[in-house]
């Protein structure tokens, strides 16, 4: 049960809803965007003000952390289970400090299981945040400060901070350090989406959201 199902059941107001794991009674709270692009979006990540520390452990990224009404990470395990039940799209919405907004939309998104380190799988990029995917293709395993699965001899998560699908280390990290305005340039460990803003630019706000492809 995701935000798309919640929407179809008649709840069309943005807010926090209780979702359930597929084939389970286990529950999780998530923010549902019921307005953008037709609604039904399950928010799986949000950065907006630096109020939450994203330099977390593997377990924390697995189960989720933060506050669904503000900055949070929904949880790799829930997202993995959800996206392996049916086909999902992923939309990433970005804001810079100059008032610009952009997005990347992937027409097929899923995460592998924990045994496969929640590897990200993406197909079919469109949008305004770069013609090239800032999440390295083919997808990489997820890495955290205590779970180094990247392709670098270094430890990307420790150097760039945050858990992410690091390559070596690659052109994005939406879970990097949050830098406020006027401190957001020439930061090598900030919130980065390279093929929109280049390197060293740390973004103001990001949202990652998913919805069934047949919504």
């Amino acid at each position: 049960r995701d935000c798309a199902e919640v929407f179809k059941s008649g709840h069309t107001t943005n807010g926090i809803y209780t979702l359930t794991f597929p084939n389970s009674t286990e529950e999780i709270k998530a923010y549902c965007d019921m307005e953008a692009g037709g609604g039904g979006w399950t928010i799986i990540q949000r950065r907006e003000d630096g109020s939450v520390d994203f330099q977390r452990t593997w377990k924390e990224y697995k189960v989720g952390f933060g506050n669904p009404s503000g900055e949070y990470w929904l949880g790799n395990e829930f997202v993995s289970q959800l996206t392996n039940q049916q086909r999902y799209v992923l939309k990433i919405h970005l804001k810079d400090w100059e008032g610009n907004e952009a997005y990347s939309l992937y027409e097929h998104f899923y995460l592998s299981s924990e045994e496969l380190n929640y590897r990200i799988h993406l197909k079919g990029l469109t949008g305004t945040a770069g013609k090239i995917s800032s999440i390295s293709q083919p997808g990489n395993d997820f890495s955290t400060k205590d779970g180094d699965n990247d392709k670098c001899m270094c430890k990307c998560s420790q150097m760039l901070t945050g858990g992410w699908w690091f390559d070596a280390c690659g052109p994005s990290n939406l879970n990097g350090m949050y830098y406020p305005q006027r401190q957001n340039t020439n930061k090598f460990n900030g919130i980065k989406w390279y093929y929109w803003k280049g390197s060293g630019y740390s973004l103001k706000a990001t949202t990652m959201m998913i919805r069934p492809a047949d919504f």
Epitope: C152, M153, C154, K155, Q158, M159, L160, D167, A168, C169, G170, P171, N186, K187, F188, N189, K192, Y194, Y195, G198, S199, G200
Partner: antibody, heavy 121, light 107 residues
Framework: QVQLVQSGVEVKKPGASVKVSCKTS????????FSWVRQAPGQGLEWLGW????????NYAQKFQGRVTMTTDTSTSTAYMELRTLRSDDTAVYYC??????????????WGQGTLVTVAS | DIQMTQSPSSVSASVGDRVIITCRAS??????LAWYQQKPGTAPKLLIH???SLQTGVPSRFSGSGSGTEFALTINSLQPEDFGTYYC?????????FGGGTRVEIK
């Protein structure tokens, strides 16, 4: 393999300008940035500045601000460094070097062979 | 700007010796540090990045260690071809800065 080939020796008079080129091959130009580093005779390494191969963003050392301009030509995969109002203490070997800009990694590999710029009246 | 202080400024050692070069940063770098080797008349060559990661093709007798403000480059069993000048470089923030260099001579 990745190669950076710089332009040849330059001899300039004080007050003149010099423009050094750095032609690259063997990799995706837009994924990387370039630092320019100089080395005066018998001295250590001094960083002049950096340019992104992706969007042309630059960052110059304060010492050279207003006197240096770094540019790229993506059609020819070439980076350029122009230094104006030359003085005798600008005599040095000037190097271009590639970094992994898209990963925010600014260690430098490989380097060009260097361009000797001599400033003398 | 971050200042990088290298020591010693020069060292003379015999083939087979262990040589340790240190580099101190004026502020914390996490692991954003690289080491280079330069031989006379040639461009510097990257040896180590991320403080301790050996660049591809560099002999395993070279190793890097440290984090924060204190770093070291160790050459185990010095070879005749290891002569030259070694530089550390911080990649934590612009402006990039180098240490003053350590000249390694073979006795």
């Amino acid at each position: 393999q990745v190669q950076l080939v710089q332009s040849g020796v330059e001899v300039k008079k004080p007050g003149a300008s010099v423009k050094v080129s750095c032609k690259t091959s063997g990799y995706t130009f837009s994924n990387n940035g370039f630092s320019w580093v100089r080395q005066a005779p018998g001295q250590g390494l001094e960083w002049l500045g950096w340019i992104s191969g992706y969007n042309g963003n630059t960052n110059y050392a304060q010492k050279f601000q207003g006197r240096v301009t770094m540019t790229t030509d993506t059609s020819t995969s070439t980076a350029y460094m122009e230094l104006r109002t030359l003085r005798s203490d600008d005599t040095a070997v000037y190097y271009c070097a590639r970094d992994q800009d898209y990963s925010n990694f600014h260690w430098l590999d490989p380097w060009g062979q260097g361009t000797l710029v001599t400033v003398a009246s | 700007d971050i200042q990088m202080t290298q020591s010693p400024s020069s060292v003379s050692a015999s083939v087979g010796d262990r040589v340790i070069i240190t580099c101190r940063a004026s502020q914390g770098l996490s692991s954003w540090l690289a080491w280079y080797q330069q031989k006379p008349g040639t461009a510097p060559k990257l040896l180590i990045h991320s403080a301790s990661s050996l660049q591809t093709g560099v002999p395993s007798r070279f190793s890097g260690s440290g984090s924060g403000t204190e770093f070291a480059l160790t050459i185990n069993s010095l070879q005749p071809e290891d002569f030259g000048t070694y530089y550390c470089q911080q990649a934590n923030s612009f402006p990039l800065t180098f240490g003053g260099g350590t000249r390694v001579e073979i006795k």
